[in-house]
């Protein structure tokens, strides 16, 4: 089982959308695949895929999941808020026919405030 995640780095503006993609491949067929997205180590969602369908369509705040055969699992955050910033990891495990698991590399999501002055004020509030 192989998991490839992208992009490595994603910078978006608050209120826009962010798309994280996880490509899951295995040489042989699988009957049920458990997938998981985490943000900063905390689980956002942990659905499974069977018969070509996801058991769950939502994933964390403003997050929507989709599965596109043969191998693409997409997490779409819309609209993006400042607290969406963080490190996202996709994990997958074949549960049937036999257990095999893998995880992707981190996607770092940076959310820029809609009002650039918010960023300046926030930085200014941490004296050096």
């Amino acid at each position: 089982l192989s998991v490839q995640q992208g992009p490595n780095l994603l910078q978006v503006r608050q209120g826009s959308q962010a798309t994280l993609v996880c490509q899951v491949d295995q040489a042989t067929a699988w009957e049920r695949l458990r997938v998981k997205w985490t943000k900063d180590g905390a689980i956002l969602c942990q659905p499974y895929i069977t018969n070509g369908s996801l058991s769950l369509g939502v994933c964390g705040p403003q997050g929507r999941l989709s599965w596109q055969a043969p191998s693409h699992l997409t997490l779409q955050l819309d609209p993006v808020s400042l607290n969406h910033s963080g490190a996202y990891v996709c994990w997958a495990a074949v549960e049937i026919p036999e257990l095999e698991e893998a995880e992707g590399n981190i996607t770092r999501l940076f959310v820029d405030p809609d009002d650039p002055t918010q960023n300046r004020n926030r930085i200014a509030s941490f004296p050096g």
């Epitope: 042989t28 067929a29 699988w30 069977t50 043969p70 191998s71």
Partner: antibody, heavy 120, light 113 residues
Framework: QVQLQESGPGLVKPSQTLSLTCTVS??????????WNWIRQHPGKKLEWIGY???????SYNPSLKSRVTISRDTSKNQFSLKLSSVTAADTAVYYC????????????WGQGTLVTVSS | DIVMTQTPLSLPVTPGEPASISCRSS????????????LDWYLQKPGQSPQLLIY???YRASGVPDRFSGSGSGTDFTLKISRVEAEDVGVYYC?????????FGQGTRLEIK
Amino acid sequence: QVQLQESGPGLVKPSQTLSLTCTVSGFSITTGGYYWNWIRQHPGKKLEWIGYIYTSGRTSYNPSLKSRVTISRDTSKNQFSLKLSSVTAADTAVYYCADMADKGGWFAYWGQGTLVTVSS
Amino acid sequence: DIVMTQTPLSLPVTPGEPASISCRSSQSLFSSNTKRNYLDWYLQKPGQSPQLLIYHASYRASGVPDRFSGSGSGTDFTLKISRVEAEDVGVYYCQQHYETPLTFGQGTRLEIK
């Protein structure tokens, strides 16, 4: 260019252990998502999958041979090996090593094959 | 184990004529999860190792002439050669990788009349 090359004795006595090594060049066997396989072809030309060792070190064997087969690897030499114990004349075959990737699942690269004869 | 059955076992063909090989599996090789058929075709030319022709039932491998085509889904698959050439002689194998143990058909020997 990926190349695989089988090596080992061409003649093995009945009841002994057949040992073959596959040396991989042009590609690291530790690269994620790859299966390193052994396949044999009997004199009648029938192809039989023996088993593989995956990137993680996990192995999978053909149930018809499982009790007699061990596939291992030496990452420092970029090699993987086959051991088949208690051989009989029915194990006489051309033995191939081949790779397979999670992205695809087909045997992309094959060695040239080595004939192993089991005879006293 | 999934049993792969090929027909015919021997196929004499006149150069320039079409050829067709059938492969049937004992269970479906189609996955509803990936929308793929886990079936590949190989050609083993005399004195050589097998080489990939078709993957996932219908996709031609890199460098394979377009006279080769694969079709079918589920349990019934076909390899077609639109116009046979002398260099196409050898043994053709179908192979499933839906599950382990990976299994091959018994082979179809194509020869020139």
